[in-house]
Amino acid sequence: LEASEEMEQEPCLAPILEQQEQVLTVALGQPVRLCCGRTERGRHWYKEGSRLASAGRVRGWRGRLEIASFLPEDAGRYLCLARGSMTVVHNLTLLMDDSLTSISNDEDPKTLSSSSSGHVYPQQAPYWTHPQRMEKKLHAVPAGNTVKFRCPAAGNPMPTIHWLKDGQAFHGENRIGGIRLRHQHWSLVMESVVPSDRGTYTCLVENSLGSIRYSYLLDVLERSPHRPILQAGLPANTTAVVGSDVELLCKVYSDAQPHIQWLKHVVINGSSFGADGFPYVQVLKTTDINSSEVEVLYLRNVSAEDAGEYTCLAGNSIGLSYQSAWLTVLPEEDLTWTTATPEAASHHHHHH
């Protein structure tokens, strides 16, 4: 990172660890300039899966990541990808440090550390940066909802965050759908919660100088009865090359026995929708599953004709739920560029 008055004339900082994740803390308002490896050609920067434009306040330009003046919304995960092979050259998380303070000359120098930006950072035990975002301690949500617990913190050295459920280390391996740990947001996200998710969730934030913790209570209110609950984000948008095999996943939670159908949207006489307003679909697969199982649609040796929209439709005695995803099928020569492109997936969620 380089603090600069004139962005155009300043060199950029090369990655410290190529192909490994790096976390950098940036002061509010500080300019950022990062170069991607030792060459400017054929390198593209992405933020949270979206390619950065070559112009603007935050831009990917000539293989460089440039931020004119760092703002809170600039925090997040950045990838630099080599265009030909789509190799991840640089995997970087930028965090905003809102703990910078001016240092007087008479402070103990042993409590200070310096950064590559020239700033001097006080060593500091972890502390909550936004306690007002943690005010809601008691959570009671209906089954199927998404729950997000946040423990935004800072410190120097940068603290780590770990999550506990009912006092035990929690990684979500035993819950359907798992969990999402978004370390740059200091958050734990659980989608499609079910009664077994009830409990006390504790964030433990620590560095070499100390630790802090905070607990949330989660109660899940059973919708009894309710239509099937589909795992958020499934099926997922998928890109495949001609001749490859594809799996589309649908995770279903239902108290009542669910009935599952996989549908492919088709075009008839140039139209995707019938006179009744419903889409034209072809039923690919029908099955009954138990409440916590995963339903998979296997597509073997895909061709260009397999591209399109697929829907997982789950019904029980109470109602229907369905979610859709797009399958993109590419010719073989396009594989190297597209398959690893971190595009932000968009999903369609429907309930009836």
Epitope: K137, L138, H139, A140, R198, T200, Y214, S215, D219
Partner: antibody
Framework: EVQLLESGGGLVQPGGSLRLSCAAS????????MKWVRQAPGKGLEWVSW????????EYADSVKGRFTISRDNSKNTLYLQMNSLRAEDTAVYYC???????????WGQGTLVTVSS | DIQMTQSPSSLSLSPGERATLSCRAS??????LGWYQQKPGQAPRLLIY???TRATGIPARFTGSGSGTEFSLTISSLQSEDYAIYYC?????????FGQGTRLEIK
């Protein structure tokens, strides 16, 4: 208007049992965590137990664990505290209280007196 | 468990005077602290939550402040109806703990 009305208190011998009730009105009872807090004569406030909206989560103070059971009937808008193996030190006014989303207690009942004495 | 210590245990002041009650936590509770008022023969009433936010219907003369481990409740000009026992309560971590109370008496 939020109202909490406790009942079921009285005089009981050591080792005996009582069941306290708290009738709630004026809010959607089934969405709130509820708590029992007690106050011994001339003493301060002591948390006894809490229960989550579904009833699926409960917790107890160490002093009553294994002897008291908290429960609720959302269809009747009623909170309960079953007290077994009562001791003299359980003598207190028992309050039911509604916990706001942040865990502070925003509404309290008027209390019911439990006296454990031989 | 977190310990909550209130001081003074009792306070005698005249109407119109300013009262300052203190509450100390044995470890940081951020701003997760409430203040309650209890009059003889009545249930406690919530005054302040989040260390400084007045509950519904609480007069502006009641002010809460502090964070971390040190908190205070200030009554700017005592009224006759303010004489009572005041309790602080932490809800940062389980179990929720109340202070032992400060008795505010008429001088």
């Amino acid at each position: 208007e939020v109202q909490l009305l406790e009942s079921g208190g009285g005089l009981v011998q050591p080792g005996g049992s009582l069941r306290l009730s708290c009738a709630a009105s004026g809010f959607t009872f089934s969405r709130y965590f509820m708590k029992w807090v007690r106050q011994a004569p001339g003493k301060g406030l002591e948390w006894v137990s809490w229960i989550s909206p579904s009833g699926g989560l409960t917790e107890y103070a160490d002093s009553v664990k294994g002897r008291f059971t908290i429960s609720r009937d959302n269809s009747k808008n009623t909170l309960y505290l079953q007290m077994n193996s009562l001791r003299a030190e359980d003598t207190a006014v028992y309050y039911c209280a509604r916990a706001s989303y942040g865990a502070w207690l925003d509404y309290w009942g008027q209390g019911t007196l439990v006296t454990v004495s031989s | 468990d977190i310990q909550m210590t209130q001081s003074p245990s009792s306070l005698s002041l005249s109407p119109g005077e300013r009262a300052t009650l203190s509450c100390r936590a044995s470890q940081s509770i951020n701003r997760n602290l409430g203040w309650y008022q209890q009059k003889p023969g009545q249930a406690p009433r919530l005054l302040i939550y989040g260390a400084s936010t007045r509950a519904t219907g609480i007069p502006a003369r009641f002010t809460g402040s502090g964070s971390g481990t040190e908190f205070s409740l200030t009554i700017s000009s005592l009224q006759s109806e303010d004489y009572a026992i005041y309790y602080c309560q932490q809800y940062d971590n389980w179990p929720i703990i109340f202070g032992q109370g400060t008795r505010l008496e008429i001088k």
